[in-house]
């Protein structure tokens, strides 16, 4: 995150930390907690690294360097890459991944609630970005989670600024005319949440931008509500119940 | 299967035009940004052109700017390059490639991904 | 326009051995905008790595590529037979978009 400022405990409870564990272990993307055994994130954060057994995911923390040998996390069962995805282009840039084990809620580790199917009338003002990404473009992972306030732009002023790009209905972008305050890399897969009502939702799953924080060059995120269908077919379980946060 | 096959190759006098085609298949043509690129006999590859998806935008070496225009037809899968106002120098092997434009790290990637096997251009009196 | 410039020339090694080829750009350049490509007599180019680092589909793992901002790095860990040829590194990061001039790999 550029820009941003270290978070307190249990203010983004969703916010997970999606690590590899090679020869060394290493903080890649960021997540968000949609249910007792269920993840959020990019799909682009598996290119490459498809096997689960490599990815451990760690609920429930503030500080990276807090992480020890002893940290309890959550191991994959099953990562869903969205069916239309590919590593060739940057649409569906979406993932769900079943842990092994669900996972208890406490004040530090509880889901985001997810947004209505279409959600497009919902006019968001209060949005924040968080994940230990990158703080500049040529930086290191944090390791306090940080949060960012970051305003909402349509996506008609999001594709005067890509041009090369085509921004899509089922993306959604984040950024100030002036740059200086962004997601960056590590933050990939991270939420993008606004209050409304004094709830919580998940609006957005961060997936790229050019540069970080650079002037007239928003962030890009995956828009959750577009993928709602998808993220309810993909988590019902066999009794027909949804295991996850439904949407408020 | 991705396939790329050009055509439209062949002997042209200096000054001449030629126009190639590139014949796509096996995947979402107008999705992607498609380019060509060249290799002069025993030479490097220079890119030449590149082309928007929807073929609004369209970019050229500095070597053929005002020579050559790349266009695409997506309800025939196909790009081509009108080559005019040819040269000695423009004698190569002509690919056409596929631009991938994927995420990652939080960044776009841009690479060429697949190729065509390539047609011959040679402009000699 | 950004200039790429690959050393050496040309690299004879045996089959088995370690080769690296280097790829140093004039200005900055994005890792995620760098790619390396494989190309044998009479042959296409063969995508091998982008983004720097990342492996193409179906490239096996003795090649790997590494580096950042102007220097980059191509890594045969153990030469094959079928990998001798010409590579490339190539940057899309601005239009024009450039190739090195290309490194030889050859038997010794």
């Known amino acids: 995150i550029v820009g941003g400022t270290n978070s307190s405990w249990g203010e983004w409870p969703w916010q997970v930390s999606l690590q590899v564990k090679l020869t060394a272990q290493r903080h890649l993307c960021g997540g968000s907690l949609i249910g007792h055994q269920w993840v959020l994130t990019a799909a682009h954060c598996f290119d490459g690294l498809p096997l689960q057994d490599v990815w451990r995911i760690y609920s429930g923390i503030l500080n990276l360097s807090d992480i020890t040998k002893d940290t309890p996390f959550s191991q994959i069962k099953e990562i869903i890459i969205h069916q239309n995805y590919k590593v060739s282009e940057g649409n569906h840039d979406i993932a769900l991944i079943k842990l092994q084990a669900p996972l208890n809620y406490t004040e530090f580790q509880k889901p985001i609630c997810l947004p209505s199917k279409g959600d497009t009338s919902t006019i968001y003002t209060n949005c924040w970005v968080t994940g230990w990404g990158f703080s500049k473009e040529k930086g290191e992972i944090q390791n306090i989670l940080q949060k960012v306030n970051i305003p909402l732009v349509t996506n008609e002023e999001c594709q005067k600024r890509y041009q090369d790009y085509k921004i899509t209905q089922r993306m959604v972008c984040a950024g100030y005319k002036e740059g200086g305050k962004d997601a960056c890399k590590g933050d990939s897969g991270g939420p993008l949440v606004c209050k409304h009502n004094g709830m919580w939702r998940l609006v957005g799953i961060t997936s790229w931008g050019e540069g970080c924080a650079r002037r007239e060059q928003p962030g890009v995120y995956t828009k959750v509500a577009e993928y709602m269908d998808w993220i309810l077919e993909k988590t019902q379980s066999s009794d027909g119940k949804a295991q996850m946060q439904s949407p408020a | 299967e991705v396939q790329l096959l050009e055509s439209g190759g062949g002997l042209v006098q200096p000054g001449g035009s030629l126009r190639l085609s590139c014949a796509a298949s096996?995947?979402?043509?107008?999705?992607?940004?498609m380019i060509w690129v060249r290799q002069a006999p025993g030479k490097g590859l220079e890119w030449v052109s590149s082309?928007?998806?929807?073929?609004?935008?369209?970019t050229y070496a500095d070597s053929v700017k005002g020579r050559f225009t790349i266009s695409r037809d997506n309800s025939k899968n196909t790009l081509y390059l009108q080559m005019n106002s040819l040269r000695a120098e423009d004698t190569a092997v002509y690919y056409c490639a596929r631009v991938a434009r994927g995420i990652a790290a939080r960044s776009r990637t841009s690479y060429f991904d697949y190729w065509g096997q390539g047609t011959l251009v040679t402009v000699s009196s | 326009d950004i200039q790429m410039t690959q050393s050496p020339g040309t690299l004879s090694l045996s089959p088995g051995e370690r080769a690296t080829l280097s790829c140093r750009t004039s200005?900055?350049?994005?890792?995620?905008?760098l790619a390396w490509y494989q190309q044998t007599p009479g042959q296409a180019p063969r995508l091998l790595i982008y983004?720097?680092?990342s492996r193409a589909t179906g490239i096996p793992d003795r090649f790997s590529g590494t580096g950042y901002g102007t220097d980059f790095t191509l890594t045969i860990s153990r030469l094959e037979p079928e990998d001798y040829g010409t590579y490339y590194c190539?940057?899309?990061?601005?239009?024009?978009?450039?190739f090195g001039q290309g490194t030889r790999v050859e038997i010794k």
């Open positions: 190539q940057q899309s990061s601005r239009t024009p978009w450039t």
């Open positions: 096996g995947f979402t043509f107008s999705v992607y940004m």
């Open positions: 082309i928007s998806p929807s073929g609004g935008q369209t």
């Open positions: 983004g720097a680092s």
């Open positions: 200005q900055f350049v994005n890792s995620n905008y």
